[in-house]
Amino acid sequence: TQHGIRLPLRSGLGGAPLGLRLPRETDEEPEEPGRRGSFVEMVDNLRGKSGQGYYVEMTVGSPPQTLNILVDTGSSNFAVGAAPHPFLHRYYQRQLSSTYRDLRKGVYVPYTQGKWEGELGTDLVSIPHGPNVTVRANIAAITESDKFFINGSNWEGILGLAYAEIARPDDSLEPFFDSLVKQTHVPNLFSLQLCGAGFPLNQSEVLASVGGSMIIGGIDHSLYTGSLWYTPIRREWYYEVIIVRVEINGQDLKMDCKEYNYDKSIVDSGTTNLRLPKKVFEAAVKSIKAASSTEKFPDGFWLGEQLVCWQAGTTPWNIFPVISLYLMGEVTNQSFRITILPQQYLRPVEDVATSQDDCYKFAISQSSTGTVMGAVIMEGFYVVFDRARKRIGFAVSACHVHDEFRTAAVEGPFVTLDMEDCGYNIPQTDESTLMT
């Protein structure tokens, strides 16, 4: 999990569409029990907003201690505040849990800016608005941290949902979701619907607002419209995918597709922004500026620093372009595209101007660690993390913010050749991926 524009955050070669339809969600295949349908008890179980993360309520220990936990697909540790901290309303008190077991091992997780460290143990964990199961899971009890917890975010820990390869201190520490699948009959799949507000929320509204849904063990059809399109998980560490083409308002950026995935492309609910490799970011911003050239914005806006404000209700969405990312499909030489609106990549910021104004930050930023499809991308889509079949599905979210003229889209198939060449092969080193 990279800090900076990461949560805790810290707050990025298509062709003509085919005439024939290629398979996407293969409806004719037998379904696993519980894989499809309705998961009423899990719908609306997330709260928060893109700038400070989405969290789910969890209980830890015996008797159960309730905590709000950030949902992070960009890391693999379950870590919770376990000592007093000025930004925490509550924390995990191991001494009060009769089922806590100490692993007698420490863990230290540094970020580009900030860090957390703690003590490893295991305890009983459940998700009240999740599957009706309790699992014994590894827990990092955070005893010290710097620039990790966010004042007013309302979460006290982090649920790393990625794979063991990037777990700390090493890949022998089983991540929570692996423990859940091993110890129960929950299918090896989860799905996320993150619902961006589209307008600023004040503190009381955030606490009262619904942020979306984490469906554990399945797919809820009520959370999306249209079809689910799947892209392969390239490697099971982060949720790594391959982008094969990028368009701004339908105009191809025309870069070598390796640049889009340099040095990787990941789907990460714990990052606020769409983060793009330097060259791609520069080309994208140039293209977005050109598309919106009837108005000019300050340099600091494009750096994600200055906020641009419009009189409430007058944000000129129409001058900003749509952004399309083409992802490798499941079928040879087939891709599909996901398209986001300015309503996703202009992030509303609360508590800065008067109620007469709507103010926004540009939520696309530069990365030195590859493309990160963060909350601003995910807020447009229902995203299925199908670990069992090593693939990630995208469909248009039923809660995405749009206007009467444009909507987010997931479309395909498109013919795209040599997509394997778009992946970047990272040289193997012992260096920490978290420190880049």
Epitope: S293, T294, E295, K296, F297, P298, D299, G300, F301, E305, Q306, L307, V308, C309, D351, V352, A353, D357, C359
Partner: antibody, heavy 120, light 108 residues
Framework: QLQLQESGPGLVKPSETLSLTCTVS??????????WGWIRQPPGKGLEWIGN???????YYNPSLKSRVTISVDTSKNQFSLKLSSVTAADTAVYYC????????????WGRGTLVTVSS | EIVLTQSPATLSLSPGERATLSCRAS??????LAWYQQKPGQAPRLLIY???NRATGIPARFSGSGSGTDFTLTISSLEPEDFAVYYC??????????FGGGTKVEIK
């Protein structure tokens, strides 16, 4: 070098419309590097931003004045203008036109200002 | 709304002395802050932008510092022509709309 000069009546009656023009000389108002703005200063008081305009005609106004303000641009004359309707004595001020440079963020060049008095 | 509070309202100093002017924002404006100088009967003049960068033609005795909510304009050794009113302005929110109330630097 580039200069800005405000012009317009120094006296306006209450409820009427204040109209000022800023003439840009020594450079083009159609430069893509700048916005152009109006700021006012009541006698003995501080500065108040009124609004900005880009040569394309894109405008931004102070929310507190928006219902009464219109800023327009005439690229052929290298001028931009301010109209403030339904004026009262509280609109008596020195009105400055200025260039918004340094990444469209700071007023780096100002006109000398013109005093407009609202009185019957 | 972001409010800029300047202090002191008036600063009485002699030529050659060091002047320290403060501007405090009601919430963080990062480093998007400017300082302007205004002499009687004249238009304001940009001195400092982005909190610490001197504008073109501004003497080295003027310097700006700070980020977030607390900013300082320092005049290392006052010249007679430096006696004026100084305003800060935030541009974290764009378009720039908020000026401080001003600090008058007068001859003691």
């Amino acid at each position: 070098q580039l200069q800005l000069q405000e012009s317009g009546p120094g006296l306006v009656k209450p409820s009427e419309t204040l109209s000022l023009t800023c003439t840009v000389s020594g450079g083009s108002i159609s430069s893509s590097s700048y916005y152009w703005g109006w700021i006012r200063q009541p006698p003995g008081k501080g500065l108040e931003w009124i609004g900005n305009i880009y040569y394309s005609g894109s405008t931004y106004y102070n929310p507190s004045l928006k219902s009464r303000v219109t800023i327009s641009v005439d690229t052929s004359k290298n001028q931009f203008s301010l109209k403030l309707s339904s004026v009262t004595a509280a609109d008596t001020a020195v009105y400055y036109c200025a260039r918004l440079g340094h990444g469209y963020s700071y007023f780096d060049l100002w006109g000398r200002g013109t005093l407009v008095t609202v009185s019957s | 709304e972001i409010v800029l509070t300047q202090s002191p309202a008036t600063l009485s100093l002699s030529p050659g002395e060091r002047a320290t002017l403060s501007c405090r924002a009601s919430q963080s404006v990062s480093s998007y802050l400017a300082w302007y100088q205004q002499k009687p009967g004249q238009a304001p003049r940009l001195l400092i932008y982005d909190a610490s960068n001197r504008a073109t033609g501004i003497p080295a005795r003027f310097s700006g510092s700070g980020s977030g909510t607390d900013f300082t304009l320092t005049i290392s050794s006052l010249e007679p022509e430096d006696f004026a009113v100084y305003y800060c302005q935030q541009v974290y929110l764009w378009p720039p709309r908020t000026f401080g109330g001003g600090t008058k630097v007068e001859i003691k």
